[in-house]
Interface confidence: low
């Protein structure tokens, strides 16, 4: 059987919703002595990096400039060491925001309810869409999508503490183009920690999971160096 | 078990102000919102707003917006409601109703009535 | 503001017999609505909760149906003690509203 090295981790740096016409970071971290490494798009070759000294890096960022909808979609990459490929990542979905129109939510009975309460958002999109997506800040990859010709409903069920925080809804022109997003609505759950819209579990900066932890070899330790990222607060 | 003891019958004269309290007992008075509703002679029930005493966030029904004014003190689980420059047709009996998703508990009632 | 509007003002039933009471919204709520049964000179007491959940310590009698815009509060056999008023309450926007009552009287 052919052998093949183990697959890299594909990550989007900040965000993998990309505003239309900003660019896009796409880390693929593989292997120290990785000669090369290739970005695919949607199964197809579109980028190559070549990090010096390979030795010394574990991963390159793929910069792709002025975001639009025909760069969204799903992305993968393999890296190279020697004559030797590696599986393909897992596939990430890079979507593009800003598009055309936004988006307004609501949520009933309302903003502030009790623990136990029945509590149902509501997405509306006046121009043509059919697919809604509602995301919580600080949790973006759970997306939770809904359908409906102007207006979607996201019924939650009985919330508890966990449901507290700000949400924020896109209409969908298709899976990898969204709209702009809504303004933010904050969830408050009587019973929570005074004054508190985010749960003590969510991070302190969206998506800190999508950063791109690529590290350096210096010597005799590895630098756990943020690599000229920057987490935002 | 839950209980809501509202205070007792007010005669006010027109323009004037009533405070109506609403002490709670019987279970966390910060877990669960704090409504209002009045009802005239023989008509039917009519929200006024509510609070939640957590975090004191108020919402009120816009016909009341001005007038009402809902309060808590979590030091004393007593909820407060009090209605400016009175009418007579303020005349009713106004009860403080505890929200979890519906109005499960209410208290006893209030007679306001205002009157020259 | 959504409208609630029950139906008929006044029913009359005679003890034994079955009552179905109408409510109907403005526009959808779902199956946040609520139901409230109100004796002369009392405070309203919670009956159904979001259109069909039954309430601990309401006898199952008590009945309701109904999702989006039309409800409906079903006594299968009335009692001497089921003679009231009885209100729909929307719980799912602000502000929160009633329906103007049903009077169930006894024929």
């Known amino acids: 059987p052919k052998q093949t090295l183990p697959k890299p981790i594909i990550r989007a740096e900040s965000t993998y919703m990309v505003p239309k016409e900003k660019q896009a970071t796409l880390c693929c971290q593989g292997s120290y002595g990785a000669v090369e490494y290739q970005l695919h798009f949607e199964g197809s070759l579109f980028a190559v990096e070549r990090p010096k000294p390979p030795e010394r890096i574990n991963g390159v960022k793929f910069h792709i400039p002025d975001m639009n909808s025909r760069k969204a979609g799903r992305y993968s990459c393999i890296y190279r060491v020697g004559e030797l490929w590696s599986e393909r990542s897992d596939l990430l979905d890079l979507v593009v925001t800003e598009m055309y129109d936004t988006p307004t939510l609501s949520v009933h009975p309302g903003p502030e309810v009790t623990s136990g309460e029945k509590v149902t958002f509501y997405c509306r999109l006046d121009t043509a869409t059919s697919m809604f997506l509602l995301l919580k800040e600080g949790r973006s990859r759970d997306v939770q999508r809904s359908y409906g010709k102007v207006q979607a409903e996201f019924p939650m069920g009985p919330v508890t503490t966990a449901h507290r925080g700000s949400y924020r809804c896109f209409g969908s022109y298709n899976n990898y183009a969204w709209s702009f997003p809504s303004e933010p609505v904050k969830l408050l759950v009587t019973g929570d920690i005074e004054n508190t819209s985010l749960a003590p579990t969510d991070p302190t900066f969206p998506d800190s999971w999508d950063t791109c932890l690529l590290t350096r070899e210096t010597g005799l330790q590895k630098d756990l160096a943020l690599w000229d990222h920057t987490a935002q607060n | 078990q839950v209980q809501l003891v509202q205070s007792g019958a007010e005669v006010k004269k027109p323009g004037s102000s009533v405070k109506v309290s609403c002490k709670a007992s019987?279970?966390?008075?910060?877990?669960?919102?704090m409504h209002w509703v009045r009802q005239a002679p023989g008509q039917g029930l009519e929200w006024i707003g509510g609070i939640s005493p957590n975090i004191g966030g108020t919402s009120y029904n816009q016909k009341f917006k001005g007038r009402a004014t809902i309060t808590a003190d979590k030091s004393t689980s007593t909820a407060y409601m009090e209605l400016s420059s009175l009418r007579s047709e303020d005349t009713a009996v106004y009860y403080c109703?505890?929200?979890?998703?519906?109005?499960?508990?209410w208290g006893q009632g209030t007679t306001v009535t205002v009157s020259s | 503001e959504i409208v609630m509007t029950q139906s008929p003002a006044t029913l009359s039933v005679s003890p034994g017999e079955r009552a179905t009471l109408s409510c109907r919204a403005s526009?959808?709520?779902?199956?946040?609505l609520h139901w409230y049964q109100q004796k002369p000179g009392q405070a309203p007491r919670l009956l159904i909760k979001?259109?069909?959940q039954s309430i601990s310590g309401i006898p199952a009698r008590f009945s309701g149906s109904g999702s989006g815009t039309d409800f409906t509060l079903t006594i299968s056999s009335l009692e001497p003690e089921d003679f009231a008023v009885y209100y729909c309450?929307?719980?799912?926007?602000?502000?929160?509203?009633f329906g103007q009552g049903t009077k169930l009287e006894i024929k």
């Open positions: 309450q929307n719980g799912h926007s602000f502000p929160l509203t």
């Open positions: 019987g279970y966390t008075f910060s877990e669960y919102t």
């Open positions: 979001y259109a069909s």
């Open positions: 109703a505890r929200r979890g998703g519906s109005f499960d508990y």
């Open positions: 526009q959808s709520i779902s199956d946040y």
